[in-house]
Each structure stands twice: as C-alpha cells, then as structure tokens.
Interface confidence: medium
C-alpha cells in the first residue's frame, strides 16, 4: 500500500503540543503514527482522531484524517496509524470513474433485462439481457424504460461537501 497524499491531506502544526510523545528517528524515519520534528531529531506522535501516518516516514506533519460525508457511513474511525474508512450508505455506491461521490443505485433493470447483481456500496445493480446474457452498459435508462422493483428515482449523484 502506498502512502498516497495530496496537499490537502497534510495537517500542519508549527510546533508539537507539549503532551505529544517523542522518540528518536531510526535511520531518519519515524514509525507509523508519528511524524518527524523540523530539526529531524524527534519523532512526534500524531493526534488520535485528528491525523495519522501509515508508514515509516519523515513527514513534517501527519496526514489529516478524512471525514465521512453525509452520504456515507463510517466503517472504522481514524487512528494514529490508519485513516478513517468510509462507505456509501445503503442504496448508493461509489464507482471507479467518480470515486469522489456516492451515486444512487438503479431501482430496476431496463425492459428485456434481468437483475443478476444487487446494489452494493461499491457497485450498482447488475443487469443482463434475458436472451443473450450480456451485461448492460450501466448507463442510466430513461424513467419510462425502467422496470422498477420498488418505487424510486433513476441514479443521481450524492452531493459531497468533503
């Protein structure tokens, strides 16, 4: 697993709070759950629930914990060594092409297709043609074409305030 960071992930702090634990770097690196001091002499612990680091590192700041969006549920909280794990809430999914937002799962398949896969937090329902068994492209059908299994609206993105 790579420590993927973006500029917004860093949790800057000019100096360590007095209560933060310190230890010495090993070959210039600090253990997971810590970052290095500006002078490179100390390892300073990340703040539980606020920031984290997952690898041996020489980061000047720990990485800022992710906050789950309103359309997500928190599977596990942020610790000093692991970021928050968020998942789309029931009835929505996160697709690879737009991972920044949870989209509503379709409520049914287009005419002439049958459902072979349920809505999960990481995938929409899966539809195949009755005869050929080939998968549907995944595009959202027009409302009038949809054979619904329960009342609902076609897929639409959840708004992310991130």
């Amino acid at each position: 697993e790579s420590a993927l960071i973006t500029q917004q992930d860093l949790a800057p702090q000019q100096r360590a709070a007095p209560q933060q634990k310190r230890s010495s770097p090993s070959e210039g690196l600090c253990p997971p759950g810590h970052h290095i001091s500006e002078d490179g002499r100390d390892c300073i612990s990340c703040k539980y629930g606020q920031d984290y680091s997952t690898h041996w590192n020489d980061l000047l700041f720990c990485l800022r914990c992710t906050r789950c969006d309103s359309g997500e549920v928190e599977l596990s909280p942020c610790t000093t060594t692991r970021n928050t794990v968020c998942q789309c809430e029931e009835g929505t999914f996160r697709e690879e092409d737009s991972p920044e937002m949870c989209r509503k799962c379709r409520t049914g398949c287009p005419r002439g297709m049958v459902k072979v896969g349920d809505c999960t937090p990481w995938s929409d329902i899966e539809c195949v043609h009755k005869e050929s068994g080939t998968k549907h492209s995944g595009e959202v059908p027009a409302v009038e074409e949809t054979v619904t299994s329960s009342p609902g609206t076609p897929a639409s993105p959840c708004s992310l305030s991130g």
Epitope: A3, Q7, Q14, E27, G28, E38, H55, D58, L59, L60
Partner: antibody, heavy 119, light 110 residues
Framework: QVQLVQSGAEVKKPGASVKISCEGS????????LHWLRQAPGQRLEWMGR????????KYSQNFQGRLSITRDTSATTAYMELSSLRSEDTGVYYC????????????WGRGTLVTVSS | QSVLTQPPSASGTPGQRVTISCSGG????????VSWYQQLPGTAPKLILY???QRPSGVPDRFSGSKSGTSASLAISGLRSEDEALYYC???????????FGGGTKLTVL
C-alpha cells in the same frame, strides 16, 4: 489549488543583485518551509537555502553564504530570494519549492525564474 | 561539497524494468531518507518518491524505491515512453546542514 507563483525573468549585470518573489496560495503559508534551488544550464539542481514561513528562521547553503538572503512577508504569503554580487556562473533557473518531509520531499514547485547575468 | 552520485544515463524498452542508483555517504543517505524527482525538459522537477519509497498522490505504482546503507535506488517497471526524462535523487546532509542532489540520470525509452 495549491500553487507557488514566481516572478518573471531577470537580466542582470555582473556585480548587481537580483530579488525573486514566490507567492504561495491554496494552503496555510505559515505552516511550511519554502526552499530555493538553482539549476544552471545543463547542471544538477543545487540547494540554496530555506525559510520557515511561520517563524522566519532561515538556513543557507555554504556555497551562497554571505550573498544570499531569504525573507518572507506572511501577509502577502510571499517568500523572497535575493542574491547579490552576481557573476556569470549565477545564470540559471531559480525555483522555490514547498517541503513536506525532513529529507527534502518537495511536493509543490514554482515554475522557475530565469536569471541571466551578462555584461 | 559532497554530492550524491548517479549514473548519467539509463535506458530500456517499453514494458521493461529499469533501475537507477544513487550513492551517497553517512551524513546524507546513511542518516536520512531519500526523495526522487522526475524532470521533463523545460519544466520544474516533480516529486515521484519521498521517505525512500512512498509515492505522492497520482504517481503510478510502477515507480518504487529502496534504500540500503548509503545507497538508494529508483525502479521503474512496465516502462512507458512518457517515462523518458531526467531523474534526480535528493537527501538532507546533516554535515553540510543542507540539501544535496545527484547529478541526474537521463532515462531513454528505446
């Protein structure tokens, strides 16, 4: 988005001074150190010095000691690099970069400022 | 002033794996971690690895790094034409109290 915007190209005569600016935006300027680097034509990158934008502390390379000054204006979220007693060997591209690791992980760079020293 | 030593050039064919070495001393690589940069002609360097082997966001996992003693190396697997660039290693030098760079390795994709 996070960016560092540097001032434009300069042409100077030997013995003169040059002052280049580097404006940071899209992040908490005071929380990072900004480093200055030079790349002479066809040469390796050379570290010049850095400033802690929060407290103003500076550190300079021995190669530039005495003729390099790095300052910052926190209200303008801008760092400045002034090099004096210019000589032809100082011709090159000067970069500012933001550092987020102790060992020189520079994640955001300015586009560079070309300084030409010629009589 | 001591600096880091890199081979001036390296090459490989698309899909191949290439390795670029970076040799230093006890006061830089021996004591601190290494960063690697990719520089395309006429552009600023771009960080591709930090803390010896960590990739910033957006850098493909084809790029990996390692460090042993006073040497470090950058490996690029599944080589692509867009990887053709100049690669620099860098580290902090405690004796000089400053940053040091390698001379750069020009990678050619044949």
């Amino acid at each position: 988005q996070v960016q560092l915007v540097q001032s434009g190209a300069e042409v100077k005569k030997p013995g003169a001074s040059v002052k280049i600016s580097c404006e940071g935006s899209g992040y908490t300027f005071n929380s990072y150190t900004l480093h200055w680097l030079r790349q002479a034509p066809g040469q390796r990158l050379e570290w010049m010095g850095r400033i802690n934008a929060g407290n103003g502390n500076t550190k300079y390379s021995q190669n530039f000691q005495g003729r390099l000054s790095i300052t910052r204006d926190t209200s303008a979220t801008t760092a400045y690099m002034e090099l004096s007693s210019l000589r032809s060997e100082d011709t090159g591209v000067y970069y500012c970069a933001r550092v987020f690791t102790y060992s020189f992980g520079m994640d955001v760079w300015g586009r560079g400022t070309l300084v030409t020293v010629s009589s | 002033q001591s600096v880091l030593t890199q081979p001036p050039s390296a090459s490989g064919t698309p899909g191949q794996r290439v390795t670029i070495s970076c040799s230093g001393g006890g006061s830089n690589i021996g004591r601190n971690s290494v960063s690697w940069y990719q520089q395309l002609p006429g552009t600023a360097p771009k960080l591709i690895l930090y803390s010896n082997n960590q990739r910033p966001s957006g850098v493909p996992d084809r790029f990996s790094g390692s460090k042993s003693g006073t040497s470090a190396s950058l490996a690029i697997s599944g080589l692509r034409s867009e990887d053709e660039a100049l690669y620099y290693c860098a580290a902090w030098d405690d004796s000089l109290s400053g940053g040091v760079f390698g001379g750069g390795t020009k990678l050619t994709v044949l």
